[in-house]
Interface confidence: medium
């Protein structure tokens, strides 16, 4: 017979014939023949395969190394890899999250635009006119200058991006 040149979905070509792939969570033990079907076996305790496959070995689950600041966010199954994330105050250095670094702090004159997560660093922004930040922080946003007028006070010292305005009493007009 004319052998197939392409196989259907969830099949693979071998010896000019199509065999069924192994389902996610199982590895290939032996290819099918005319008399025997594809033989697959479940992945072991700390292993996985996440696609229909013909792999003879399962992949090892990722190890979330605490020495690198990592912890398990989601335990792996036979069909999914372990997902690591970083300990509190740290974030991943890459999409694969192979190691962590301490969240960046925003220097005085800069405020937090976006607080860091386990996978993204702190995003800082310069404090615009009318706002300031006088601390180095991974959480603090730029604060608005104090409004002296609403307190019936006057500006005695102008604010900067690092300092608040200083308010003082209004000069009394003499009679």
């Amino acid at each position: 017979p004319e052998p197939p040149t392409a196989c259907r979905e969830k099949q693979y070509l071998i010896n000019s014939q199509c065999c069924s792939l192994c389902q996610p969570g199982q590895k290939l033990v032996s290819d099918c023949t005319e008399f025997t079907e594809t033989e697959c076996l479940p992945c072991g305790e700390s292993e996985f395969l996440d696609t229909w496959n013909r792999e003879t070995h399962c992949h090892q689950h990722k190890y979330c190394d605490p020495n690198l600041g990592l912890r398990v966010q989601q335990k792996g199954t036979s069909e999914t890899d372990t997902i690591c994330t970083c300990e509190e105050g740290w974030h991943c250095t890459s999409e694969a999250c192979e190691s962590c670094v301490l969240h960046r702090s925003c220097s005085p004159g800069f405020g937090v635009k976006q607080i860091a997560t386990g996978v993204s660093d702190t995003i800082c922004e310069p404090c615009p006119v009318g706002f300031f930040s006088n601390v180095s922080s991974a959480f603090e946003k730029c604060h608005p200058w104090t409004s002296c007028e609403t307190k019936d006070l006057v500006v005695q010292q102008a604010g900067t991006n690092k300092t608040d305005v200083v308010c003082g009493p209004q000069d009394r007009l003499r009679a």
Partner: antibody, heavy 125, light 112 residues
Framework: QVQLVESGGGVVQPGRSLRLSCAAS????????MHWVRQAPGKGLEWVAV????????YYADSVKGRFTIYRDNSKNTLYLQMNSLRAEDTAVYYC??????????????????WGQGTTVTVSS | DIVMTQSPLSLPVTPGEPASISCRSS???????????LDWYLQKPGQSPQLLIY???NRASGVPDRFSGSGSGTDFTLKISRVEAEDVGIYYC?????????FGQGTKVEIK
Amino acid sequence: QVQLVESGGGVVQPGRSLRLSCAASGFTFSSYAMHWVRQAPGKGLEWVAVISYDGSNKYYADSVKGRFTIYRDNSKNTLYLQMNSLRAEDTAVYYCARRGHYGNNYYSYYGLDVWGQGTTVTVSS
Amino acid sequence: DIVMTQSPLSLPVTPGEPASISCRSSQSLLPGNGYNYLDWYLQKPGQSPQLLIYLGSNRASGVPDRFSGSGSGTDFTLKISRVEAEDVGIYYCMQALQTPRTFGQGTKVEIK
């Protein structure tokens, strides 16, 4: 139409031989693996043997291994079962059956989709 | 060898009523490729067996849709949604995972 016709059955004494034939028509015989299945009087179905589409691979039930030989002649569209050293317990209706497959992928499996009408073998002294 | 066990061995039915036959295998017929290697065959009185269901749940060509196969691993069921008089005969399950192929003992379906 697709058809399998067995022949060669009969009454035979224990220890003697018999050859069964299965003539195929209506399909490309050389593309299909073929099975022999038997049924003793009043009993269920028992698988006997299978041969690959090209005759290169053969498997047998333990009960017939070493006594029966399955073979085929694709030029004659015919399957055979050579039965030697016959025993009383080989008495049965013998059916040939086609192993169905998808398109031209003869590794795929679609059941034993065509059966012959059967031929009766009686082993008795 | 894989042992196939059917139940019941005899099933009296009423035309128009549903019927169900169970088949159990001594080992899983799901080798990890997503298919269950279990067939159902019907042998009508005085006839050769005929294929009803292959790979657990696929109806063979020309088989009425009142027949359905289900199950996975080691436990399988053949259901007839509404039995007709022509459905009488002996039903066999067969494992197609490995040689030797093995059949269940058969379930005799007869009209009450």
